[in-house]
Interface confidence: low
């Protein structure tokens, strides 16, 4: 009696169980009563990453330099190419289909976390006592100058964008 279900790594076709093609190979012809499944390896720029009955391999991803992409890991017959972003850029999505420049933190904000190839710069507002007067992708908020340690007094208060201005103490006669 013909089977209704097949073992792992097999598939049901024409009332019989045929072997699936291994990763890296595509199906050329189904098995018959007399012959095994015929599989053919994927070509140089293609892959299949599972046991399958696909008649065509998938094309490797192209890391398009126009989109800021570069090869992180070259594809094989069993794995897709992995793209990453060029220096100074990060992926716009988890699948990394294109890249954008890292964000700079504006004056008044400092870098909390420097960007990576997959994540953008994380900025944070400079808290009281700290400032940033630059637009930067790596500068943290800096502490206001301590006038006291220089035996000076604050002449102009600091903000989140400017340092304090120190000056000499008024000397009474």
């Amino acid at each position: 009696e013909p089977p209704t279900a097949c073992r792992e790594k097999q598939y049901l076709i024409n009332s019989q169980c045929c072997s699936l093609c291994q990763p890296g190979q595509k199906l050329v012809s189904d098995c018959t009563e007399f012959t095994e499944t015929e599989c053919l390896p994927c070509s140089e720029s293609e892959f299949l990453d599972t046991w399958n009955r696909e008649t065509r391999c998938h094309q490797h991803k192209y890391c398009d330099p126009n989109l800021g992409l570069q090869v992180q890991q070259k594809g094989t017959s069993e794995t897709d190419t992995i793209c990453t972003c060029e220096e100074g850029l990060h992926c716009t999505s988890e699948s990394c289909e294109s890249c954008v420049p890292h964000r700079s933190c504006l004056p008044g904000f400092g870098v909390k976390q420097i960007a990576t190839g997959v994540s953008d710069t994380i900025c944070e507002p400079c808290p009281v006592g700290f400032f940033s007067n630059v637009s930067s992708a790596f500068e943290k908020c800096r502490p206001w100058t301590s006038c006291e340690t220089k035996d000076l007094v604050v002449q102009q208060a600091g903000t989140n964008k400017t340092d304090v201005v120190c000056g000499p103490q008024d000397r009474q006669r």
Partner: antibody
Framework: QVQVQESGPGLVKPSDTLSLTCTVS????????MSWIRQPPGKGLEWIGA???????YYASWAKSRVTISVDTSLNQVSLKLSSVTAADTAVYYC?????????WGQGTLVTVSS | DIQLTQSPSFLSASVGDRVTITCQAS??????LAWYQQKPGKPPKLLIF???NLASGVPSRFSGSGSGTEFTLTISSLQPEDFATYYC??????????FGQGFGGGTKVEIK
């Protein structure tokens, strides 16, 4: 800067071995296949062979018995050796990045086989 | 090795003409086909791979089509800088001992 440059002697004697070096910069040889192609004067392009990012070598059938392609990733270099040369091996020899998608080529180096 | 038959070998055309070059592979190479442009004294320049994908910086007047054994390169409106020799190149890979790779014989596009 991403580039590929071939170097080697411009003149080789018949029956000697032709040795060329391809020096790359701006990318890693472990991430790319590299191919050698040649072009006899006034003729078309002829694929010689390639070396994969993992080190596997692939040669055109005419070249199998005479060609060796190797890679030194630490020096960023791919080399081509063609033994028992004749006048028919006179050509511009190109090194290129890739296999079927040759996206980066050297300027080529002319090798003349003559006594 | 794989045989790639390119036609025509020579082609005379004028600026603004639509030009078509064909490449026939001796066996199925899926979409593993590239097109290159070569000018005298220069290395070839990648135009298209795989089969129909334009390489970086290539003008949109170039297009490619085909799969399996029949491929076409089309230049929709020939420009003065397009007069050159064009090559197809294709291959397949199954293992270090079973693969194919080759170039077509080239098509020289000349000014009429």
């Amino acid at each position: 800067q991403v580039q590929v440059q071939e170097s080697g002697p411009g003149l080789v004697k018949p029956s000697d071995t032709l040795s060329l070096t391809c020096t790359v910069s701006g990318f890693s040889l472990s991430s790319y296949d590299m191919s050698w192609i040649r072009q006899p004067p006034g003729k078309g392009l002829e694929w010689i062979g390639a070396i994969g990012g993992a080190g596997g070598t692939y040669y055109a059938s005419w070249a199998k018995s005479r060609v060796t392609i190797s890679v030194d990733t630490s020096l960023n270099q791919v080399s081509l050796k063609l033994s028992s040369v004749t006048a028919a091996d006179t050509a511009v020899y190109y090194c290129a990045r890739g296999w079927t998608r040759l996206d980066l080529w050297g300027q080529g180096t002319l090798v003349t086989v003559s006594s | 090795d794989i045989q790639l038959t390119q036609s025509p070998s020579f082609l005379s055309a004028s600026v603004g003409d639509r030009v078509t070059i064909t490449c026939q592979a001796s066996e199925d190479i899926s979409s593993n086909l590239a097109w290159y442009q070569q000018k005298p004294g220069k290395p070839p320049k990648l135009l298209i791979f795989p089969a129909s994908n334009l390489a970086s910086g290539v003008p949109s007047r170039f297009s490619g089509s085909g799969s399996g054994t029949e491929f076409t390169l089309t230049i929709s409106s020939l420009q003065p800088e397009d007069f050159a020799t064009y090559y197809c190149q294709g291959g397949y890979w199954t293992s270090t001992s079973n693969f194919g790779q080759g170039f077509g014989g080239g098509t020289k596009v000349e000014i009429k």
